[in-house]
């Protein structure tokens, strides 16, 4: 053997080296790679050093028996059956409350004849739940509402007012409370004639004691 070169580098099972016929002089770099479904164990890059030895031990190619970590999904939690995701492992994604799942909830790590194991599906997404709007309430008689839309998004507020000479009975502003379904925080108010209010408020009601009701009247009721 020549004494001015590094030793010959062999092929490795389930992998190859590049260049395939390297010069074995000082400074030469050789890279080992593995066939699909295998991964390099050890250093994949070897260099012929000044002392004519290789910088690292020869690597090997080991069968890949697990899937990569599919990752976290925003606005969710995940339940894992095996921490290193071997073939057969499952990962379940559950969206946080107020979010809906788009995609597969459960992923399973499957083996493949050729290539590395693969997840049954891609990780899902958790999207913000679309809350249903509230249906527009009609304006009270002799009054108005603002805004005058047919649908009001969850969280929106509508305001009521009365025509001159009328007063508002009830809440002047009501809110579309988010939910399933969304709903109004209060019933719509009514507009009453101001003069009638004054009339009733300034008078007390006298009640005359009625005679005892006869049984015929009772029967009629």
């Amino acid at each position: 053997p020549r004494n001015d070169t590094c030793p010959e580098l062999p092929e490795i099972p389930n992998g190859w080296k590049s260049p395939s016929q390297p010069e074995l002089v000082h400074g030469t770099v050789v890279t080992y790679q593995c066939y699909p479904g295998y991964q390099v164990v050890g250093s994949s890059v070897l260099m012929c050093q000044w002392d004519l030895t290789w910088s690292e031990d020869l690597p090997s190619c080991q069968r890949v028996t697990s899937c990569h970590d599919p990752g976290d999904v925003e606005h969710s939690r995940r339940l894992i059956s095996s921490p290193k995701f071997p073939v057969g492992a499952t990962v379940q994604y559950i969206c946080d409350q107020g979010f809906v799942l788009m995609g597969s909830s459960i992923l399973t790590c499957h083996d493949r004849q050729a290539g590395s194991p693969k997840w049954s599906d891609r990780a899902p997404k958790c999207l913000l739940e679309q809350l249903k709007p509230c249906h527009g309430l009609s304006a009270p008689e002799n009054g108005a509402r603002s805004p005058e839309k047919q649908l009001h998004p969850a969280g929106a507020t509508i305001h009521f007012s009365c025509a001159p000479g009328y007063v508002l009975k009830g809440q002047a502003s009501i809110k579309c409370v988010p939910g399933h379904p969304s709903h109004w925080s209060d019933p719509p108010p009514i507009c009453r004639a101001a003069s009638l209010d004054g009339f009733y408020n300034s008078r007390s009601l006298d009640v005359a004691k009625a005679p005892a009701a006869s049984s015929t009247l009772d029967a009629a009721h």
């Epitope: 339940l79 059956s81 990962v91 379940q92 559950i94 946080d96 409350q97 739940e129 939910g179």
Partner: antibody, heavy 120, light 106 residues
């Protein structure tokens, strides 16, 4: 009706492990995730994690990762929670709990609780 | 994680009075759940999804709120209502609970 029955009180030394069981009845055990919640004396409630009894998948509160292990035995409809490297501040009542439906977020059913005392 | 702050820490009222318990979240949440706990007992679900009552819970209990501010109301206190009340969210993992409001007899 749904019932969750837990194992009895335990006294442990610091550094030891404890394993609490929760036997479910009145529903199909594998249909609902089982959660574990603890409550230190005079304190509030703290979610520890959950297990899906069907696939055996677990999800833990980051605070307990590396110390808690949740398992189940579907043949006897029982869930287990093991907490290792116990410290005195792990003294608490440990509850198993179940939600109303598979995809709901409130704890509708609770075990009676298991008091774990950690003391040297 | 989302921090839930309950107020007041202690509420002293008499039977027949109206109780209003508050729960404030450090970030917006979509729903709030409420529990009642009596000494030596497990918590009991009282309100879920902000305003829904589980079967068997009396109608004097009601819940409301949205965003960061939620309220549990007991319209007319019964002797058996004196206990500790907790709010809980799961709009973000991990689910978290408030530190509790103790409702005591005045």
């Amino acid at each position: 009706q749904v019932q969750l029955v837990q194992s009895g009180a335990e006294v442990k030394k610091p550094g030891a492990s404890v394993k609490v069981s929760c036997k479910a009845s009145g529903y199909t055990f594998t249909d609902y995730n089982m959660h574990w919640v603890r409550q230190a004396p005079g304190q509030g409630l703290e979610w520890m994690g959950e297990i899906n009894p069907n696939i055996g998948g677990t999800g833990y509160n980051q605070k307990f990762k590396g110390r808690v292990t949740m398992t189940r035995d579907t043949s006897i409809s029982t869930a287990y929670m093991e907490l290792s490297r116990l410290r005195s501040d792990d003294t608490a009542v440990y509850y198993c709990a179940r939600t109303y439906s598979y995809y709901s977020y409130e704890f509708a059913y609770w075990g009676q609780g298991t008091l774990v005392t950690v003391s040297s | 994680e989302i921090v839930l702050t309950q107020s007041p820490a202690t509420l002293s009222l008499s039977p027949g009075e109206r109780a209003t318990l508050s729960c404030s979240a450090s970030s917006s949440v979509s729903y709030m759940h409420w529990y009642q706990q009596k000494p030596g007992q497990a918590p009991r679900l009282l309100i879920y999804d902000t305003s829904k009552l589980p079967s068997g819970i009396p109608a004097r209990f009601s819940g409301s709120g949205s965003g960061t501010d939620f309220t549990l109301t007991i319209s007319s206190l019964e002797p058996e209502d004196f206990a500790v009340y907790y709010c809980q969210q799961w709009s973000s993992t991990p689910p978290t609970f408030g530190q509790g409001t103790k409702l005591e007899i005045k």
